[in-house]
Interface confidence: low
């Protein structure tokens, strides 16, 4: 018996061939012997089956001795053995219809689980293999689950269903809703303007929700809400904003915040949370601000940084074009009685300079100049 696999919603064509290459009497029945369709001369006749409005044939092929059964908009319950009767012969074809669907929605938040459910006819024992856009293979039976979805899981998942040595392929487009970066860090000299950007890693027609930026300043004992906002069809409107600092927010995506001045009291970590309409759960992006200050007080030249720096970062003070006078894995370095000239305070990671502040040290009778 020939086995044909079909996909729910698709069209399938079951073949039936006579030895005579001409139009002769034929008809198709299901396993209950109920007539589906056949011919009377050059006319197509249909029987009382449930397939009535979805069954068809190709009259153009009858003259060649081919009498196909075409079933449109396949349903799982169309799985059956179909019998073609022609020239006193019976050709049997077993049709197995499968469907593969994603749980609830194909737009899922980062960290959520994706469950793919296989609809299959009773008595079948299919195996499924799915390949994610990043090339990860998963196998299973009636359900496949992937926990903790990552950004790279966005895209087309290709799933192959295997039954009776036959394969049928499904493609499901999954969109993982997330920020492009889980975390970012901004390095600024004291007094500079700070730009925070929160680009999303997906595009959708309409985007509605609300968000908030909580900030934990290094010097503060508790965190505070810096800004809350609404998102309506990709338009941003500020609901509430703190007065210190005076934050400004862009009106369009990507989400964009401006802090007029980087000051030591603002250095710290923030968490931007975005709750999207009709989604359970929230998107998060961490943002960090590191602020540097170089000062000269009497005979002491000091360089300090505030904010979340990792222990591997190096803070150095050096006279321009000379070797570093002092380099430490600490948040403050200083030089006593610095010689006159342009001094550089450098924050670096494995030799790469992340932040630099210059201060001009004048002879002791002058006042220091901060460029």
């Amino acid at each position: 018996k020939k086995v044909v696999l079909g996909k729910k919603g698709d069209t399938v064509e079951l073949t039936c061939t006579a030895s005579q290459k001409k139009s002769i009497q034929f008809h198709w029945k299901n396993s209950n012997q109920i007539k589906i369709l056949g011919n009377q001369g050059s006319f197509l006749t249909k029987g009382p089956s449930k397939l009535n409005d979805r069954a068809d044939s190709r009259r153009s092929l009858w003259d060649q001795g081919n009498f196909p059964l075409i079933i449109k908009n396949l349903k799982i319950e169309d799985s059956d053995t179909y019998i073609c009767e022609v020239e006193d012969q019976k050709e049997e074809v077993q049709l197995l219809v499968f469907g593969l669907t994603a749980n609830s929605d194909t737009h899922l938040l980062q960290g959520q689980s994706l469950t793919l459910t296989l609809e299959s006819p009773p008595g079948s024992s299919p195996s499924v293999q799915c390949r994610s856009p990043r090339g990860k293979n998963i196998q299973g039976g009636k359900t496949l689950s992937v926990s903790q979805l990552e950004l790279q899981d966005s895209g087309t998942w290709t799933c192959t269903v295997l039954q009776n040595q036959k394969k049928v392929e499904f493609k499901i487009d999954i969109v993982v809703l997330a920020f492009q970066k889980a975390s970012s860090i901004v390095y600024k000299k004291e007094g500079e303007q700070v730009e925070f950007s929160f680009p999303l890693a997906f595009t959708v027609e309409k985007l509605t929700g609300s968000g908030e930026l909580w900030w934990q300043a290094e010097r503060a004992s508790s965190s505070k809400s810096w800004i809350t906002f609404d998102l309506k069809n990709k338009e941003v409107s500020v609901k509430r904003v703190t007065q210190d600092p005076k934050l400004q927010m862009g009106k369009k995506l990507p989400l964009h915040l401006t802090l007029p001045q980087a000051l030591p009291q603002y250095a710290g970590s923030g968490n931007l949370t975005l709750a999207l309409e009709a989604k359970t759960g929230k998107l998060h992006q961490e943002v960090n601000l590191v602020v540097m200050r170089a000062t000269q007080l009497q005979k002491n030249l000091t360089c300090e940084v505030w904010g979340p720096t990792s222990p591997k970062l190096m803070l150095s003070l050096k006279l321009e074009n000379k070797e570093a006078k002092v380099s430490k894995r600490e948040k403050a370095v200083w030089v006593l009685n610095p010689e006159a000239g342009m001094w550089q305070c450098l924050l670096s990671d494995s030799g790469q300079v992340l932040l630099e502040s210059n201060i001009k040290v004048l002879p002791t009778w002058s006042t220091p100049v901060q460029p």
């Epitope: 293999q129 090339g135 196998q139 903790q148």
Partner: antibody, heavy 118, light 107 residues
Framework: QVQLVQSGAEVKKPGSSVKVSCKAS????????IDWVRQAPGQGLEWMGG????????TYAQKFQGRVTITADESTSTAYMELSSLRSEDTAVYYC???????????WGQGTLVTVSS | DIQMTQSPSSLSASVGDRVTITCRAS??????LNWYQQKPGKAPKLLIY???SLQSGVPSRFSGSGSGTDFTLTISSLQPEDFATYYC?????????FGGGTKVEIK
């Protein structure tokens, strides 16, 4: 308990081919990918490629593309790795290992030493 | 391909010591990192999968942590049978890649 049993040690001449087998027993290993990983003497682990026996899907490391062929016989639950155009630097222990959903190798074969020498 | 860098390449420790091995990926691998133990002449053995999940049958003195690019394998109290070579492996992107290994020797 899943077990992966590999074929015995081989001594080969440069330019020839070697085919190593890996028989799975005691579990539904056909549903899983079987990867091949090699380890040169005193060196680290190097991924060569893999197959999902149930589907015949193969993936190869670029370094071995064209020289390695991984196959599987579902009826005997056996995976095979054939490496052609052997050179002395292919002298290594070749392992088969079962891959889980998380991309880790939870069961390993005992290893097959292939020595390439003229 | 993603490069996996293990450090240190070797270390000497005594029974009862707390041992930490680090593994760094050249780009984010989320939590798709696995740790293996290998003894001379034997196949590697899975200890930790998905960065921090302990493989069944592995003693609880082994633990894993980290996500993104930096990961750690910790042995809280080194036992005589723990002297071996340890490998990390990323499974986030094809092809899977291994770290160079860390040999834990008796002091």
């Amino acid at each position: 308990q899943v077990q992966l049993v590999q074929s015995g040690a081989e001594v080969k001449k440069p330019g020839s081919s070697v085919k190593v087998s890996c028989k799975a027993s005691g579990g539904t290993s056909n549903n899983y990918a079987i990867d091949w990983v090699r380890q040169a003497p005193g060196q680290g682990l190097e991924w060569m490629g893999g197959i999902i026996p149930l589907f015949g899907t193969t993936t190869y490391a670029q370094k071995f593309q064209g020289r390695v062929t991984i196959t599987a016989d579902e009826s005997t639950s056996t995976a095979y790795m054939e490496l052609s155009s052997l050179r002395s630097e292919d002298t290594a222990v070749y392992y088969c290992a079962r891959v889980t959903l998380y991309g880790d190798y939870d069961y390993w074969g005992q290893g097959t030493l292939v020595t390439v020498s003229s | 391909d993603i490069q996996m860098t293990q450090s240190p390449s070797s270390l000497s420790a005594s029974v009862g010591d707390r041992v930490t091995i680090t593994c760094r990926a050249s780009q984010s691998i989320n939590r798709y990192l696995n740790w293996y133990q290998q003894k001379p002449g034997k196949a590697p053995k899975l200890l930790i999968y998905a960065a921090s999940s302990l493989q069944s049958g592995v003693p609880s003195r082994f633990s894993g942590s980290g996500s993104g690019t930096d990961f750690t394998l910790t042995i809280s109290s080194l036992q005589p049978e723990d002297f071996a070579t340890y490998y990390c492996q990323q499974a986030n992107s094809f092809p899977p890649t291994f770290g160079g290994g860390t040999k834990v020797e008796i002091k």
